[in-house]
């Protein structure tokens, strides 16, 4: 069904990283416009991106209200210039998205090594606690605030002079590792949520090596 010359959206896809969440769909509109609605299982549909010619809609503001809820979105198609028109079923043509649970499905963004500090044969590596768009009491929460102990970081480190990698894990944002005195090391970190079944790992952070600006070396 649907209004003449109006086609339903398809390939509705959630794109979400660190809770920044955008719904994308096809096709590029020809003589039609779209409106998006989003709801939890309560069925209280909220309209967003009214009568847009875009094929994406930023739904971050809605999903951050409760990242543990499961959401469904639907994209309505209307003829351009005649948005009151409805299909033969007495309602505009629409398509539903897959369900989306931000806490379980948002991609983990690429982490950043904030600093590393060597004290003798120990190196303290600190991962930047990235801010998300999730708010509590008018304050933006960090990734650690949101995920708590569900989030761990894996550190990959190796001597600059060799390729053999070692790993360490932490459920905070800091690592304290043993190194050989007089050797320079390189570091990369990865965010991981072990309890997840999908999107468990982030991409690796950019590599940082000792002897560069990020680090501090103190001989004891």
């Amino acid at each position: 069904s649907g209004t003449t010359n109006t086609v339903a959206a398809y390939n509705l896809t959630w794109k979400s990283t660190n809770f920044k969440t955008i719904l994308e769909w096809e096709p590029k509109p020809v003589n039609q416009v779209y409106t998006v609605q989003i709801s939890t299982k309560s069925g209280d549909w909220k309209s967003k991106c009214f009568y847009t010619t875009d094929t994406e809609c930023d739904l971050t503001d809605e999903i951050v209200k409760d990242v543990k809820q499961t959401y469904l979105a639907r994209v309505f198609s209307y003829p351009a210039g005649n948005v009151e028109s409805t299909g033969s079923a007495g309602e505009p043509l629409y398509e539903n998205s897959p369900e989306f649970t931000p806490y379980l499905e948002t991609n983990l963004g690429q982490p950043t090594i904030q600093s590393f500090e060597q004290v003798g044969t120990k190196v303290n590596v600190t991962v930047e606690d990235e801010r998300t768009l999730v708010r509590r009491n008018n304050t933006f929460l960090s990734l650690r605030d949101v995920f708590g102990k569900d989030l761990i970081y894996t550190l990959y480190y190796w001597k600059s002079s060799s390729s053999g990698k070692k790993t360490a894990k932490t459920n905070t944002n800091e690592f304290l590792i043993d190194v050989d005195k007089g050797e320079n090391y390189c570091f990369s970190v990865q965010a991981v949520i072990p309890s997840r079944t999908v999107n468990r790992k982030s991409t690796d952070s950019p590599v940082e090596c000792m002897g560069q600006e990020k680090g501090e070396f103190r001989e004891i």
Epitope: S1, S39, T40, K41, S42, G43, D44, W45, Q69, L72, A89, E91, E95, N96
Partner: antibody
Framework: EVQLLESGGGLVQPGGSLRLSCAAS????????MAWVRQAPGKGLEWVSA????????YYADSVKGRFTISRDNSKNTLYLQMNSLRAEDTAVYYC???????????WGKGTTVTVSS | DIQMTQSPSTLSASVGDRVTITCRAS??????LAWYQQKPGKAPKLLIY???SLESGVPSRFSGSGSGTEFTLTISSLQPDDFATYYC????????FGGGTKVEIK
């Protein structure tokens, strides 16, 4: 355990009114849309009405529009169906159901019987 | 409104049989279809939603498939507890049920 318990059914004359209730327990009532579905004797299932979690959105089958009103009291975890101008063809078992997004019914009550007869 | 047509209306089968019930929609409903089981004097029970997603606690012998206008509920090996009436339901546009398929003992 998630449970739904309907009440308020009975025998009523054509043109009369009846109010069905559905008491919910075992889940966060306000977080789910709810629906009423009926089944006439020996017949199949017919969707009657649905309501969003906040009560702000309501939907009706054409066969009951203007006669039936769905509502909910989230403070009492209770769903209602006010049925006016009842007809013989409204005779059925009425089920209340938990309905994620208002789309499908994942938990059903045992049903309450409404008989419209003179 | 979208019409849902189930076939057959009655199906005779034996324990252990593979049983297939078909549901056709009058227009495309993508994958927005649910299947229910109902026994006499009891409330319906959700088996499948979104055409192929098995509801929690439902035995794996039940499976759903299809998209667009044609859908299938399959019981891989019929058990004594499976003799019942089965309904499909679309939720693409409002809600409509199929007329039901009664699975009876051969």
């Amino acid at each position: 355990e998630v449970q739904l318990l309907e009440s308020g059914g009975g025998l009523v004359q054509p043109g009369g009114s009846l109010r069905l209730s559905c008491a919910a327990s075992g889940f966060t009532f306000s977080s789910y849309a709810m629906a009423w579905v009926r089944q006439a004797p020996g017949k199949g299932l017919e969707w009657v009405s649905a309501i969003s979690g906040s009560g702000g959105l309501t939907y009706y089958a054409d066969s009951v529009k203007g006669r039936f009103t769905i509502s909910r009291d989230n403070s009492k975890n209770t769903l209602y169906l006010q049925m006016n101008s009842l007809r013989a063809e409204d005779t059925a078992v009425y089920y209340c159901a938990k309905a994620p997004y208002g789309y499908y019914m994942d938990v059903w009550g045992k049903g309450t019987t409404v008989t419209v007869s003179s | 409104d979208i019409q849902m047509t189930q076939s057959p209306s009655t199906l005779s089968a034996s324990v252990g049989d593979r049983v297939t019930i078909t549901c056709r929609a009058s227009q495309s409903i993508s994958s927005w279809l649910a299947w229910y089981q109902q026994k006499p004097g009891k409330a319906p029970k959700l088996l499948i939603y979104k055409a192929s997603s098995l509801e929690s606690g439902v035995p794996s012998r039940f499976s759903g498939s299809g998209s667009g206008t044609e859908f299938t509920l399959t019981i891989s090996s019929l058990q004594p507890d499976d003799f019942a009436t089965y309904y499909c339901q679309q939720y693409k546009s409002y809600i409509t049920f199929g007329g039901g398929t009664k699975v009876e003992i051969k």
